[in-house]
Amino acid sequence: MAVTACQGLGFVVSLIGIAGIIAATCMDQWSTQDLYNNPVTAVFNYQGLWRSCVRESSGFTECRGYFTLLGLPAMLQAVRALMIVGIVLGAIGLLVSIFALKCIRIGSMEDSAKANMTLTSGIMFIVSGLCAIAGVSVFANMLVTNFWMSTANMYTGMGGMVQTVQTRYTFGAALFVGWVAGGLTLIGGVMMCIACRGLAPEETNYKAVSYHASGHSVAYKPGGFKASTGFGSNTKNKKIYDGGARTEDEVQSYPSKHDYV
């Protein structure tokens, strides 16, 4: 019962986590910036992984996607990749974990198969969560170290000049959503891995071999060293020596903590 609860809870926590990772990836508020501020009008810029938005104090908002892949910082591309890998792994993990749930019966699936699937999905959730946490952390590091902050560069041309403006970006809501979601996915994955141990069947699939002391197999006869060791002729036609090795199928032995390797 505890195993089923752990597995079910792990699935639900991971599901919420992956939904959060998807939400964070799609959100525009990865970084927010107070660009222009005076008593009459205020214009704010916030940027996500896919597009940049500007919003007026009146609430009017306009968003546009980034022009090209080539003009974007490599770090942004890396964050995109990490988040997408996290989503894909998480989605596959969810699919696998649905079939692995103990409360769902599919044909004659054995517990060992369910245990393996639970472990697989658990590992996928852990990696998915780590990808999301890594992606968000890389982006946050870019903000903290002012990765894209350039000094006030001037470009002069036929039509006047263009000046880059030194700006300050702060953490957007998507970063916090991503961190929490990644953490939840990670926790869900750990819970699935813990549940896997409980799902593993009691008996092992291979034949365990137990070794017993075999003192009766050597018959000592007084009067010289004439002992029947089982290697010579067996006149009485009975099994004298069997090497002391017996499989569990051949002999009934009481369970012992030393029986199984």
């Epitope: 009459v40 214009v43 104090s57 306009e62 546009r64």
Partner: nanobody, 120 residues
Framework: QVQLVESGGGLVQPGGSLRLSCAAS????????TGWYRQAPGKQRDLVAT???????NYADAVKGRFTISRDNAKNTVYLQMNNLEPEDTAVYFC?????FGFGDRRVAWDQGTQVTVSS
């Protein structure tokens, strides 16, 4: 690279009108604000009027009620209609564009300015 081309300046009598226009060309991801500054001889550059991407306008106290800023999104052009001009309005008028060029890249483009002279 964004380029601004301004037109409409010239000599006008007091009480007269002029219409300045500023056309922008080039790659702009997000437009923030656009508008005009002016610089009279021997003085610093002062804000005249601005208009945000959403159409919110802002005017310097000295020109309120006389100047009107507007824009044409289709033509990427901003206009400054100047009515009831006074000799104090004589200055070089600079058009500017505050915009987002790319990811985390905010820029301000300026034109070379156009002379407006109010004299009888």
């Amino acid at each position: 690279q964004v380029q601004l081309v301004e037109s409409g300046g010239g000599l006008v009598q007091p009480g007269g009108s002029l219409r300045l226009s500023c056309a922008a060309s080039g790659s702009i991801l997000n437009l923030m604000t656009t508008g005009w500054y002016r610089q009279a001889p021997g003085k610093q550059r002062d804000l005249v009027a601005t208009i945000t991407f959403g159409g919110t306008t802002n005017y310097a106290d000295a020109v309120k009620g006389r100047f009107t800023i507007s824009r044409d999104n289709a033509k990427n052009t901003v206009y400054l209609q100047m009515n009831n001009l006074e000799p104090e309005d004589t200055a070089v008028y600079f058009c500017y564009l505050d915009y987002i060029f790319g990811f985390g890249d905010r820029r301000v483009a300026w034109d070379q300015g156009t002379q407006v002279t109010v004299s009888s």
